[in-house]
Interface confidence: low
């Protein structure tokens, strides 16, 4: 990692964002925007694993845009940016920005689906189903096998979402998936199916789905 040797207390960190999203399908044009809290002369974009800046931009404003054209999975990874002002001494740059994880993929990893406190519940009791991926800020959907439309949707800031199933309609086979909250949409694989049953109800003949 890059450890600046100059004292940086007075040079606040910039913010790095991605448009249209930080999770995209291959072939999309992605713009990484580095926004400084003050007007800057030069911006540098760094990618983890490279010991030299990936790109430089000379601008006299608060933000710089770095264009990644028709991204490939190899361009995914951890990015951060820094800025500097003309009147600073040689080599004195700002603190690093937040780390932006860029993911370029056709399909997101399969989430897990677990029941809390467990998949066997007392008749009429509520149960919580947690659909967990590895990427925060996704939209999660819960399906009941045999029902075409999602039972519930949740936009979550966490890499998981908790779905609450109420009472008597609980038993059944469930699965979930997640996707990016805005276009270009990238979908995950569906989770493995999870069977929820009432205590003492014996084996249930629910369609497993795929």
């Amino acid at each position: 990692d890059f450890t600046p040797t100059a004292p940086l207390a007075s040079y606040p960190q910039p913010w790095l964002g991605a448009h249209p999203a930080a999770v995209v399908t291959p072939g999309i044009n992605v713009t990484l925007t580095c926004r400084a809290p003050q007007s800057a002369w030069r911006f540098a974009l760094f990618k983890s694993g490279l010991v030299t800046p990936l790109l430089l931009r000379d601008v006299s404003v608060e933000l710089a845009e770095f264009f990644l054209e028709e991204v490939t999975p190899a361009q995914g990874g951890s990015y951060h940016c820094r800025y500097r002002k003309t009147d600073w001494g040689p080599g004195v740059w700002s603190q690093p920005s937040n780390v932006l994880e860029l993911l370029v993929t056709d399909q997101l990893p399969r989430p897990s689906l677990v029941a809390l406190p467990g998949p066997v519940v007392a008749p009429g009791a509520n149960v919580s189903l947690r659909c967990a991926g590895r990427i925060p800020g996704m939209s999660f959907a819960l399906y009941r096998v045999g029902v075409a439309t999602p039972l519930q949707y949740i936009d979550s800031v966490q890499p998981w979402a908790d779905f609450l199933l109420i009472g008597t309609h609980t038993p059944g086979t469930y699965c979930c998936y997640y996707h990016t909250p805005s276009a270009p949409y990238v979908l995950s694989q569906r989770s493995q199916p999870l069977v929820i049953s009432f205590e003492g109800s014996g084996s249930l003949d629910y369609t497993q789905g795929n």
Epitope: F2, T3, A44, L50, V51, L56, G91
Partner: antibody, heavy 118, light 108 residues
């Protein structure tokens, strides 16, 4: 005009030391990754060491401990301190500037010849 | 011995198309960019191709680069006598730069 000028090469005995310099002009020295690459007579290019914009220098395995890279941003100069020199260190030493699309070297100096011989 | 493997020599006649290969592994070429350099006798190397297939300004479009998996190649079309030189591929692997052993191109 962008220019790199190496100096400090010459004849040195085995076990001796030498300090190479690379003076840069024409751009903001402190913004770039700088590196040394060498070429033994009749042989190919071999990366020696690099000095990043931020953080610790990095070295090819063969040179860790014997060679030290450093930079003086105020003088726009890159250095290579070479200790415990051996006959096989005889080579032309080039300094080069790295570009920003994944680690290529876009500007090279003319090179300085180091000869290690008794 | 170089981690990136190039043929030691290649040749062609004026006007011909010549290709020089560079073979590596997933830890270098497979996951990183490849660059190509031309070194004329007695001179410093000159950047020909960077980022797998990009040409710096001033490099003729007769020179082109490509990468597939863990291998890369440099193609020179419309070969000229002044193309006679050594050609080196270069990539990156866990904080160090790697060069191929070089290919001596002879224009017959």
């Amino acid at each position: 005009e962008v220019q790199l000028l190496e100096s400090g090469g010459g004849l040195v005995q085995p076990g001796g030391s030498l300090r190479l310099s690379c003076a840069a002009s024409g751009f903001t020295f402190s913004d770039y990754y700088w590196t040394w690459v060498r070429q033994a007579p009749g042989k190919g290019l071999e990366w020696v060491s690099g000095s990043p914009v931020f953080g610790a220098a990095n070295y090819a395995q063969n040179f860790q401990g014997r060679f030290t890279i450093s930079r003086d941003n105020s003088k726009n100069t890159l250095y290579l301190q070479m200790n415990s020199l051996r006959a096989e260190d005889t080579a032309v030493y080039y300094c080069a500037k790295a570009g920003f699309t994944g680690g290529h070297f876009d500007i090279w100096g003319q090179g300085t010849l180091v000869t290690v011989s008794s | 011995q170089s981690v990136l493997t190039q043929p030691p020599s290649a040749s062609g006649t004026p006007g011909q198309r010549v290709t020089i290969s560079c073979s590596g592994s997933s830890s270098n070429i497979g996951n990183n960019y490849v660059s190509w350099y031309q070194q004329l006798p007695g001179t410093a190397p000159k950047l020909l191709i960077y980022g797998n297939s990009n040409r710096p300004s001033g490099v003729p479009n007769r020179f082109s680069g490509s990468k597939s998996g863990t291998s890369a190649s440099l193609a020179i079309s419309g070969l000229r006598s002044e193309d006679e030189a050594d050609y080196y591929c270069q990539s990156y692997d866990s904080s160090s730069w790697l060069f191929g052993g070089g290919t001596k191109l002879t224009v017959l």
